[in-house]
């Protein structure tokens, strides 16, 4: 049974490809899903020689590997696109890379700008 999960209703939204996909670039996303299914937030990004390039942020449908994650932490060593998910409103505002091989933990803070 699920116990004490943080309910996710809103996530930080971002789309680097917003012009092509004809969406907003950034803001808040209200999560919608089927009854009895859990919802999560996610973040995805690239890391080019230490420069973080945000790809997308938003809501993520019920995914068991996201259950009970309070923080958005990616663990893959060196993927093309880093991915993390979490539960709780706006939990994808900050995201972290904590490689499984035990490298340094790197946390990315959002720039202090208002959503558009």
């Amino acid at each position: 049974s699920g116990r004490g999960e943080a309910e996710t209703r809103e996530c930080i939204y971002y789309n680097a490809n917003w012009e092509l996909e004809r969406t907003n670039q950034s803001g808040l996303e209200r999560c919608e899903g089927e009854q009895d299914k859990r919802l999560h937030c996610y973040a995805s990004w690239r890391n080019s020689s230490g420069t973080i390039e945000l790809v997308k942020k938003g809501c993520w449908l019920d995914d068991f590997n996201c259950y009970d994650r309070q923080e958005c932490v990616a663990t893959e060593e060196n993927p093309q696109v880093y991915f993390c998910c979490c539960e709780g409103n706006f939990c994808n505002e900050r995201f972290t890379h904590l490689p499984e091989a035990g490298g340094p933990e790197v946390t990315y803070e959002p720039p202090p700008t208002a959503p558009t």
């Epitope: 049974s1 699920g2 116990r3 004490g4 999960e5 089927e34 009895d36 299914k37 859990r38 449908l61 019920d62 995914d63 068991f64 590997n65 996201c66 259950y67 009970d68 994650r69 932490v73 663990t75 991915f83 998910c85 904590l98 499984e100």
Partner: antibody
Framework: EVQLLESGGGLVQPGGSLRLSCAAS????????MSWVRQAPGKGLEWVSS????????YYTDSVKGRFTVSRDNSRNTLYLQMNSLRAEDTAVYYC???????????WGQGTLVTVSS | QTVVTQEPSFSVSPGGTVTLTCGFN?????????PSWYQQTPGQAPRTLIY???TRSSGVPDRFSGSILGNKAALTITGAQADDESDYYC??????????FGGGTKLTVLG
């Protein structure tokens, strides 16, 4: 290299108990959801139970609810399945599996055989 | 009770193409069920082939592909080889922690 090593299987009488263990290595265990899947002799695969990264959420197939308990010790990198009130129909090879994003099983152990017979 | 259905058996000639399907009794399979496919040979642990409908797992040859066909998930094997003779299982994630396996398809490669 990811490794999942099940142990604890064996022969047990109906109504008896067993505890299966799955020792994990080669990945950050505390950051992975985990599952148990079983296969009765000559039959197909059947999902048995899953547990979230913290252990705070656990789920079971209907036929084992109230009899089986899944748990994990993240400090020991070990997954457990406590099986009580065992029945003949629980006879199977039990696999532990790592769950990845998109809710799929990306790595499997080699399995441990549980035989329930008098 | 959700029942996931697969063809019990299928045969294919070497070099041929075969499509195995995976449906369920309470609606259409969509990408939100994260369909995944596994190959198992007798006495061995399952091997992950396809996840998230159509993404090949690491090391899986591109002869294997996944898709949604109509209201079912599908696994297509093109250029079938003798060592593709195995049991194939689909899994649907129903949400709320519940995974459901199909009954499996026994694939025979003729000749």
């Amino acid at each position: 290299e990811v490794q999942l090593l099940e142990s604890g299987g064996g022969l047990v009488q109906p109504g008896g108990s067993l505890r299966l263990s799955c020792a994990a290595s080669g990945f950050t265990f505390r950051n992975s959801a985990m599952s148990w899947v079983r296969q009765a002799p000559g039959k197909g695969l059947e999902w048995v139970s899953s547990i979230s990264v913290t252990g705070g959420s656990t789920y079971y197939t209907d036929s084992v609810k109230g009899r089986f308990t899944v748990s994990r010790d993240n400090s020991r990198n070990t997954l457990y399945l406590q099986m009580n009130s065992l029945r003949a129909e629980d006879t199977a090879v039990y696999y532990c599996a790592k769950v990845y994003y998109y809710s799929f099983f990306d790595y499997w152990g080699q399995g441990t055989l549980v035989t329930v017979s008098s | 009770q959700t029942v996931v259905t697969q063809e019990p058996s299928f045969s294919v000639s070497p070099g041929g193409t075969v499509t195995l399907t995976c449906g369920f009794n309470s609606g259409s399979v969509s990408t939100s069920y994260y369909p995944s496919w596994y190959q198992q040979t007798p006495g061995q642990a399952p091997r992950t082939l396809i996840y998230n409908t159509n993404t090949r797992s690491s090391g899986v040859p591109d002869r294997f592909s996944g898709s949604i066909l109509g209201n079912k998930a599908a696994l297509t094997i093109t250029g079938a080889q003798a060592d593709d003779e195995s049991d194939y299982y689909c899994v649907l994630y129903m949400g709320s922690g519940i995974h459901v396996f199909g009954g499996g398809t026994k694939l025979t490669v003729l000749g």
